[in-house]
């Protein structure tokens, strides 16, 4: 067991052209703080996948605000470290992921708001016990400067961690084959200890914390004997010696609980007795609880009110993501029906409706001939979210209360005059063209193309449109 | 100005389940999460649960095994269901609306008394 | 779950004095996620502080909140005749949302 312990000395514009905007003015006050995420071996994981090796939150920083036409200086930084203990051996090799959060602190609706400023990553090779290992990482124009150290928490020593060490009982010299523990020379090499309840007479172990049968014993804690009893003997390592049944590899083989968890068969599969700290199927997902307040934007923290449970949180609308890091755009989701103007206030959403709909969402379709009159014999006729009048000939307008002239759309065809009666309109046709808005031409033998003139009528005479 | 009203019979008797309606108006149920809240009288305030128009819901634990919340996005209401309720479940009942800042409650209704009595 | 507890349950003072209301937590409330009520008898409660310090809308400047982790304030400039009625705190940082016991401003 041990902590990997994190300092950050500076986050502030990097070097080169381009430099940042400050991410606080004086009329957005903001302060920073970190979040660290581990994993162990030279992993290339998501950003969202689980902190196996743990996870830390700094503390708030100062409240800051920008000088007015300052460049971006280093940003003031929270105090102390930030600790990620772990209760396993320490891997040697591990992945971490540094992210630079802004508070924003300004009169916004909703109080403080949470951005992502920067995130940086890495994989790199360290071991326990050694000094500071300084790093410098950049992140856009953003240039994140810190040290980091993983140190053993007594009696582990050893560049795992794994080596325990226990005051000397003689003063001279420690236990048959046992060292002492540079750099603690006045303590021994403590004995290994196996995983808990490893049966001590049939299994023994190597490293700490696992258990490893000898030849006739199976199970996670060597207390299942092999059915061939021929096979047994007193010492050695199991193995499959011709003759005798040694079961398949058995769901625990290898321990698939991380962290420290415990693995017991079960009918069908395993299942990880987890430390406090951790849960998850395997024990891979460290224990942020809801009191780390890991819920940003107003997010609610449900669960997690200890740290063998689970959080999860609950986002206001605007906002996703496992801990409401993310702002949604409300408007993609297309909430305004029949065509509305979606409007993103922040503190709502608000719809534009177009003409005859109406509703927050502008769900309901306004009946649009209610209470409309078309006046002089016209109809009322709905469509598309506004009435429409259809007027009787001669009248016209949106409520048919205006004369209409039916000729102002020159109806009459190939030079035919158009005059106004009192039931429509008469075309007067040019010599050569016949019918009602003198469409037809006449045939040069006095048989029209189209319909025969009606009696009464010759071609060439006005024709009434009716 | 959205405004929330309570509706749902005054009196229940001990075992019975209490039900309760909230409507809404002035504004879309699915753009916020929804909240029944109680005030036992002359006490203080009692959250119940909430719920949001996709169906996440969450209870006070104190209540988690008698309630249940549900919502009607089409008739822009929500309700409340209380099982076996005694003389102690006696409150108003207030249906609120939560903050898109955070579960803090920006408009609530003007309440209903539920009167558990034989 | 987090614990509200408000002090003191009653504050006699009169028209103009200045009222200090105080809410403690049984455990830190993160990122400042308190929010303060007021109730008027036979009416529902109403909004006047979120996120520990920010008015909400219509709410008088004489109202105004502060603190932070699990020591909160509400403070009342100068107490206007509307104002003696009862305040309660309301935490929205974890599940279950909690409220306190209230604190009744009453006339001197």
């Known amino acids: 067991a041990g902590v990997f312990e994190l300092q950050i000395h500076s986050f502030g514009p990097g070097p080169g052209p381009g430099a940042p905007r400050s991410p606080c003015s004086a009329r957005l006050p903001c302060r920073l703080f970190f979040r660290v995420c581990l994993k162990p071996g030279l992993s290339e994981e998501a950003a969202e996948s689980p902190c196996a090796l743990g996870a830390a939150l700094s503390a708030r920083g100062p409240v800051y605000t920008e000088q007015p036409g300052a460049p971006a200086p280093d940003l003031p930084l929270p105090d102390g470290l930030l600790q990620v203990p772990f209760r396993d051996a320490w891997p040697g090799t591990f992945s971490f992921i540094i992210e630079t959060w802004r508070e924003e602190l300004g009169d916004q609706i909703g109080g403080p708001a949470w951005s992502l400023l920067a995130r940086v990553a890495g994989r790199r090779r360290l071991a326990a016990g050694g000094p500071w290992a300084r790093d410098i990482q950049r992140a856009g124009a953003w240039e994140l400067r810190f040290s980091y150290r993983a140190r053993c928490e007594p009696p582990a020593v050893g560049t795992a961690c794994t080596r325990l060490c226990r005051p000397r009982s003689a003063p001279s010299r420690c236990g048959p084959g046992l060292r002492p523990c540079a750099p603690l020379e006045d303590e021994c090499e403590a004995p290994l200890v196996c995983r808990a309840g490893c049966s001590p007479e049939h299994g023994f172990c190597e490293q700490p914390g696992e258990c490893r049968c000898l030849e006739g014993w199976t199970g996670p804690l060597c207390t299942v004997p092999v059915s061939t009893s021929s096979c047994l003997s007193p010492r050695g390592p199991s193995s499959a010696t011709t003759g005798c049944l040694v079961p398949g590899p058995g769901p625990c083989d290898g321990n698939p609980c991380a962290n420290g968890g415990s693995c017991s068969e079960t009918p069908r599969s395993f299942e990880c007795t987890c430390p406090r700290g951790f849960y998850g199927l395997r024990c891979e997902v460290s224990g942020v609880t809801c009191a780390d307040g890991p819920c940003f934007n107003g997010g609610l923290c449900v669960g997690g009110a200890d740290p063998d449970s689970a959080y999860i949180c609950h986002c206001p609308p605007g906002f996703q993501g496992s801990n409401c890091e993310k702002r949604v755009d409300r408007c993609s989701l297309q909430p305004c029906r029949n065509g509305g103007l979606c409007l993103d206030l922040g503190h709502a959403l608000r719809c534009r409706c177009r003409a005859g709909f109406a509703g927050p969402r502008c769900e309901h379709d306004l009946d649009d001939c209610a209470g409309r009159a078309c006046a002089n014999g016209g109809t009322c006729v709905e469509g598309g979210g506004a009435h429409r009048c259809s007027c009787a000939l001669g009248f016209g307008g949106r409520d048919c209360r205006e004369r209409a002239d039916p000729c102002a759309a020159r109806p009459c065809a190939h030079g035919g005059r158009c005059y106004a009666h009192f039931s429509g309109l008469v075309c007067a046709c040019a010599p050569g063209y016949m019918g009602a808005r003198c469409e037809f031409p006449v045939h040069p033998d006095g048989a029209s193309a189209l319909p025969a003139a009606p009696p009464g009528l010759r071609p060439g005479d006005p024709q009434r449109y009716l | 100005q959205v405004q929330l009203q309570e509706s749902g019979p005054g009196l229940v008797k001990p075992s019975e389940t209490l039900s309760l309606t909230c409507t809404v108006s002035?504004?879309?149920?699915?753009?916020?999460?929804w909240s029944w809240i109680r005030q036992p009288p002359g006490k203080g305030l009692e959250w119940i649960s909430y719920?949001?128009?996709?169906?996440?819901?969450n209870y006070n634990p104190s209540l988690k095994s008698r309630v249940s919340i549900s919502v009607d996005t089409s008739k822009n209401q929500f309700s409340l269901r209380l099982s076996s309720v005694t003389a102690a479940d006696t409150a108003v009942y207030y249906c609120?609306?939560?903050?898109?800042?955070?579960?803090?409650?920006?408009?609530w209704g003007q309440g209903t008394l539920v009167t558990v009595s034989s | 779950e987090i614990m509200l507890t408000q002090s003191p349950d009653t504050l006699s003072l009169s028209p103009g004095e200045r009222a200090t209301l105080s809410c403690r937590a049984s455990?830190?409330?993160?990122?400042?996620?308190l929010a303060w009520y007021q109730q008027k008898p036979g009416q529902a409660p109403r909004l006047l502080i979120y996120g520990a310090s920010s008015r909400a809308a219509g709410v008088p400047d004489r109202f105004s909140g502060s603190g932070s982790g699990t020591d909160f304030t509400l403070t009342i400039s100068r107490l206007a005749p509307e104002d003696f009625v009862v305040y309660y705190c309301q935490q929205y940082g974890i599940s279950p949302l909690t409220f306190g016991g209230g604190t009744k401003v009453e006339i001197k």
């Open positions: 719920i949001y128009y996709s169906g996440i819901s």
């Open positions: 609120a609306r939560i903050s898109v800042a955070g579960f803090f409650f920006d408009n």
């Open positions: 455990q830190s409330v993160s990122s400042s996620y």
């Open positions: 002035s504004d879309s149920i699915s753009s916020y999460y």
